[in-house]
């Protein structure tokens, strides 16, 4: 905390300018007027102040709003902004995109802060909903944020903001997420024809129930391999395997480098083995045939 | 006058960890930003991270983030560089510099402390 | 990250020569721009910040100039002292980056 003492003679800031870096801390207090600060903030950003400099610049703001910062000042905050908590920040009631485009844009190229990840958070909630310009301006910024949201707060995002993203969008997603966007995927894409609509669900796939794929596997979409592999599971063992061969197309070769994997491992086992040698593709382990398959679950279905 | 020692390095394996300190002295630590800087022999400089002041935020090259963590003890003068799955191409003098603001030049420098990751 | 581009990367001179070394930015750094000495086994020494703005001490033989992607570091009267690597630094953005140095020799 920094002492109130009265500004020397001929020392008080008529402006903000580059003069006030030669201030000590307890000059700039007692000699810039917060309310011209805060007229003045867009210029602080040009200014070579010291991280002591700036603690008085922010405690001046402070004390001039203590209920928190009003919009207008907030999106001129420039680096200063890097200087609040998060409790700073959950005072404020940020409403225009252009205002978190230019608080994204000082932490720009790093990963999400505290600061910044507050400050979505309050934006968000304020509009009720992840609509597609914030998903879109969020993403360009951090293409990591779907996946950084639980489920509970992807229910949401609106079929219309999944236009906005981006494969590399859902790259850290679990299948908790996906399987949350993939429903809404599947309704914003829902008029494309078979080829475009295969390009846009593909990322979202991990959400997929067995019904999808194997109405995928009657389209020739020609699934590659890193796609099938990140498939759901559960949805992945019911495909026959005359379904996976269509569904991947010529990439079907790739199983073989990957039988030791889930889910091909797993649906391996759960096909007869003279289906799979239909393949050619040398994979081992299915059902040796003769055997006798009991489906329990259904068993225990029925019962 | 301002006084910057570097200490902790050494050869280690790959995928071992190292940390590093650098003892500050002549100014008051806790105003001013601190950073590291490395030079693999021969090469150019290449600037690692830096903390603020306070602490409160830190930032990272791309060739570290997610391996090494910069840190600080204000109440002990020193700054820290935790260095975790180390490899080859992290083999270099490690210098701590200082910086007193977000638009400032790194003004004073450590003589550096050489760290060789080999097997 | 903004790339910094240094240019010669070893400059032969001789005592009593003008140098120019150049360094250019991948954007706009506005005059966010600083140049240090290395000698080798020394540690960098700070001589030129916002561009031109010289370090307390360092001679007045080193001048600098530039804004935003085009920057210059000119000594006017090269000394036996200032046979060294210099390297610019852009501090505008919190990942300061530095160019890869050029080397003055004597010729």
């Known amino acids: 905390e920094v002492e109130k003492t009265a500004c020397p003679s001929g020392k008080k800031a008529r402006e903000i300018d580059e003069s006030l870096i030669f201030y000590k801390k307890w000059e700039l207090e007692a000699c810039v007027d917060a309310a011209l600060l805060a007229t003045q903030m867009d210029r602080v950003n040009a200014i070579p102040f010291t991280y002591e400099q700036l603690d008085v610049l922010k405690h001046k703001l402070d004390e001039l709003y203590p209920q928190g910062y009003p919009e207008s000042v907030i999106q001129h905050l420039g680096y200063l902004f890097l200087k609040m908590s998060p409790e700073d920040i959950r005072k404020w009631n940020v409403t225009s995109l252009e205002t978190l485009k230019a608080l994204l844009e000082v932490n720009k190229g790093h990963e999400m802060s505290p600061q910044v990840a507050t400050l979505i958070d309050r934006f968000v909630k304020g509009r009720g909903q992840l609509d597609k310009d914030t998903l879109d301006t969020l993403t360009a910024f951090y293409p990591g944020y779907l996946c950084s949201l639980s489920p509970e707060e992807l229910s949401s995002v609106p079929p219309s903001s999944i236009w906005a993203v981006r494969p590399q969008d859902l790259d850290t997603c679990d299948p908790r997420q996906l399987d949350v966007l993939y429903p809404k995927a599947r309704l914003a894409f829902q008029n494309m024809n078979g080829s475009e609509y295969f390009v846009k669900i593909q990322s979202f796939l991990g959400g997929a129930p067995t019904e999808d794929l194997k109405a995928l596997s009657q389209q020739n979409v020609s699934m590659d391999l890193a796609t099938f592999m990140k498939l759901r599971t559960d949805a992945v063992l019911p495909l026959t395997v005359a379904e996976v061969q269509k569904l991947l197309g010529p990439h079907v070769e790739g199983l073989k480098a990957e039988e030791r994997h889930r889910p091909v491992r797993d649906w391996i086992l759960r096909q007869r083995q003279d289906d799979l040698d239909t393949l050619g593709l040398g994979l081992q382990g299915g059902i040796p045939n003769g055997y006798l398959v009991l489906d329990l679950s259904m068993q225990e279905a029925l019962s | 006058q301002v006084q910057l020692v570097e200490s902790g390095g050494g050869v280690v394996q790959p995928g071992r960890s190292l940390r590093l300190s650098c003892a500050a002295s002549g100014f008051t630590f806790s105003s001013d930003g601190m950073n590291w800087v490395r030079q693999a022999p021969g090469k150019g400089l290449e600037w690692v991270a830096v903390?603020?002041?306070?602490?409160?935020?830190?930032y990272y090259a791309d060739s570290v983030k997610g391996r090494f963590t910069i840190s600080r003890d204000n109440s002990k003068n020193t700054l820290y560089l935790q260095m975790n799955s180390l490899r080859a191409e992290d083999t270099a003098v490690y210098y701590c510099?200082?910086?007193?603001?977000?638009?400032?030049?790194?003004?004073?420098w450590g003589q550096g402390t050489l760290v060789t990751v080999s097997s | 990250d903004i790339q910094m581009t240094q240019s010669p990367s070893t400059l032969s001179a001789s005592v009593g020569d003008r140098v120019t070394i150049t360094c250019r930015a991948s954007q706009s750094i506005s005059r966010w721009l600083a140049w240090y000495q290395q000698k080798p086994g020394k540690a960098p020494k700070l001589l030129i910040y916002?561009?031109?703005s010289l370090e307390s001490g360092v001679p007045s033989r080193f001048s600098g100039s530039g804004s935003g992607t085009e920057f210059t570091l000119t000594i006017s009267n090269l000394q036996p002292d200032d046979f060294a690597t210099f390297y610019c630094?852009?501090?505008?953005?919190?990942?300061?980056?530095f160019g890869q140095g050029t080397k003055v020799e004597i010729k």
């Open positions: 510099a200082r910086d007193r603001g977000p638009l400032w030049p790194l003004d004073y």
């Open positions: 903390i603020w002041n306070d602490g409160s935020n830190k």
């Open positions: 630094q852009q501090y505008t953005s919190y990942s300061r980056t």
């Open positions: 916002k561009a031109s």
